[in-house]
Amino acid sequence: WELTILHTNDVHSRLEQTSEDSSKCVNASRCMGGVARLFTKVQQIRRAEPNVLLLDAGDQYQGTIWFTVYKGAEVAHFMNALRYDAMALGNHEFDNGVEGLIEPLLKEAKFPILSANIKAKGPLASQISGLYLPYKVLPVGDEVVGIVGYTSKETPFLSNPGTNLVFEDEITALQPEVDKLKTLNVNKIIALGHSGFEMDKLIAQKVRGVDVVVGGHSNTFLYTGNPPSKEVPAGKYPFIVTSDDGRKVPVVQAYAFGKYLGYLKIEFDERGNVISSHGNPILLNSSIPEDPSIKADINKWRIKLDNYSTQELGKTIVYLDGSSQSCRFRECNMGNLICDAMINNNLRHTDEMFWNHVSMCILNGGGIRSPIDERNNGTITWENLAAVLPFGGTFDLVQLKGSTLKKAFEHSVHRYGQSTGEFLQVGGIHVVYDLSRKPGDRVVKLDVLCTKCRVPSYDPLKMDEVYKVILPNFLANGGDGFQMIKDELLRHDSGDQDINVVSTYISKMKVIYPAVEGRIKFSHHHHHH
């Protein structure tokens, strides 16, 4: 019996087609992805093959103005239109709190939404009961297939699930649910979830009875043969894990942003054992036409986005200096504003010992692309912020050793004075540079804001300590020459859309007046370029 698994993960609000790098589509003939194009390919496969499941491994939420405006209603509407068969909850599905998951998505989805390792307690237990499930048995042709869901247990640090959801260890939670499926005589079981490739492989190895793992969260690109675009494969598709009980378990993921449709064919014997598995992600490029009816629906929903982008979010009573003459040379108040917003967006009081789990932010000055003039009645719009942060990036959470941070700050000024983008803006960090010293030895003071404290204060950076830092995904991926971050990071979790973080902060504060306040200093006479 043959099953075709089509899968997406980490789509992050890319409802419209995008450029090759998943940013805004400029030249339509070169654009990729989007739900209209995805639907064309899915329908083509459904017509050609008998037993097809379309699965999503989480993080549909968050990433473009679509989510900012529609808050998840767009996800339910278009996933319903595409007839997804099941979805696992990702960490970003909790970005607008539990209510922001229940109302727009859980109540409106016409397909099951899954997670076995999220347990509700207190008053939420009865409210959310039945709205998501640990597993679902789906009828496929004359057979049944069990899908069991899982979600990153780091979600309380990455999003806003509140205090009434407990995120259990994935493997511990999955095993009894798989066992339950076995007692229901379900002998073909897919683990569908959002914990990253390392956990996907562990699930394949450790959870008895799981036949296939379909994952997300780590944006992992797997491919067999010559890859069709810029993504470099982390391994073959499917990635085969030998389980502890000796079975060959295929593990798949399909990069991110709806650029590819994962395509995996599995052959089962009559006892539900995997005989063979093969496939590859399908690049959704312009050779696949966009479905006209879905495209028309997208265009209809688009209208509200254009209106939103010109509405006032809040006001500034000071000039927001995002000029390259400032942000690439010294502390600029636009950099301070953005870093303050980044920290504010990551406030999670999950431990009584810590006022917050993260206090530090770094931001490459080259990523700040425009100032905002306060002499326009102080008005700040999404459109204004899109000029400041035009690259459609995310502000991510990483864990780094102090020694890596020290290298990053040395890199920040290693060729100071040439208006290069690597000069770092900061939050929760006080740095002093001495430019009279040789490159690689210019950081003379680096103090960081404590987290395990009731009154936050600045302490010297410790080289061997592990710190959490919020930074742009561009830096996490080694951009602007920050190779040491990419090479030495201990953990990397994708965060919220950059513009959304700043716009939410401005809306919350209503009136802003960021200052230049001595976060970055130069010792001796090296104050100016």
Epitope: R83, D85, K107, A109, K110, F111, P112, G130, L133, K136, V137, L138, P139, V144, L184, N185, V186
Partner: nanobody, 124 residues
Framework: DVQLQESGGGLVQPGGSLTLSCAAS????????IGWFRQVPGKEREGVSC????????NYADSVKGRLTISRDNAKNTVYLQINSLKPEDTAVYYC?????????????????WGQGTQVTVSS
């Protein structure tokens, strides 16, 4: 949580008719596919009819084809099963079951929510 309550069962003469109702609470019926099952003591639960979430597709077991009609009234959050030309072998406990999915099935494992059942006895 989804709760299902069957009603309309009872004692009926052979050749008679009956309409069973399944009322859902705690969830809008719109997105649920509903199945009717029956069980005779000592035997497995048997799927007799099903209606998908859109109401556009229905199916019936061969043993009851032509004698059953399944329908839904989403406004009333209720699904109905009309049984005509009742036979003694139709005597069973009738259960309605639901699951959030586009498609129907006659397989017990597929359904996530079950009612308590209503007894139908066909006897003269």
């Amino acid at each position: 949580d989804v709760q299902l309550q069957e009603s309309g069962g009872g004692l009926v003469q052979p050749g008679g008719s009956l309409t069973l109702s399944c009322a859902a609470s705690g969830f809008t019926l719109d997105y649920l596919s509903i199945g009717w099952f029956r069980q005779v003591p000592g035997k497995e639960r048997e799927g007799v009819s099903c209606i998908n979430s859109s109401g556009g597709s229905t199916n019936y077991a061969d043993s009851v084809k032509g004698r059953l009609t399944i329908s839904r009234d989403n406004a009333k959050n209720t699904v109905y099963l009309q049984i005509n030309s009742l036979k003694p072998e139709d005597t069973a406990v009738y259960y309605c079951a639901a699951h959030k999915y586009y498609y129907c099935s006659n397989k017990v494992a597929v359904f996530d929510y079950w009612g308590q059942g209503t007894q139908v006895t066909v006897s003269s």
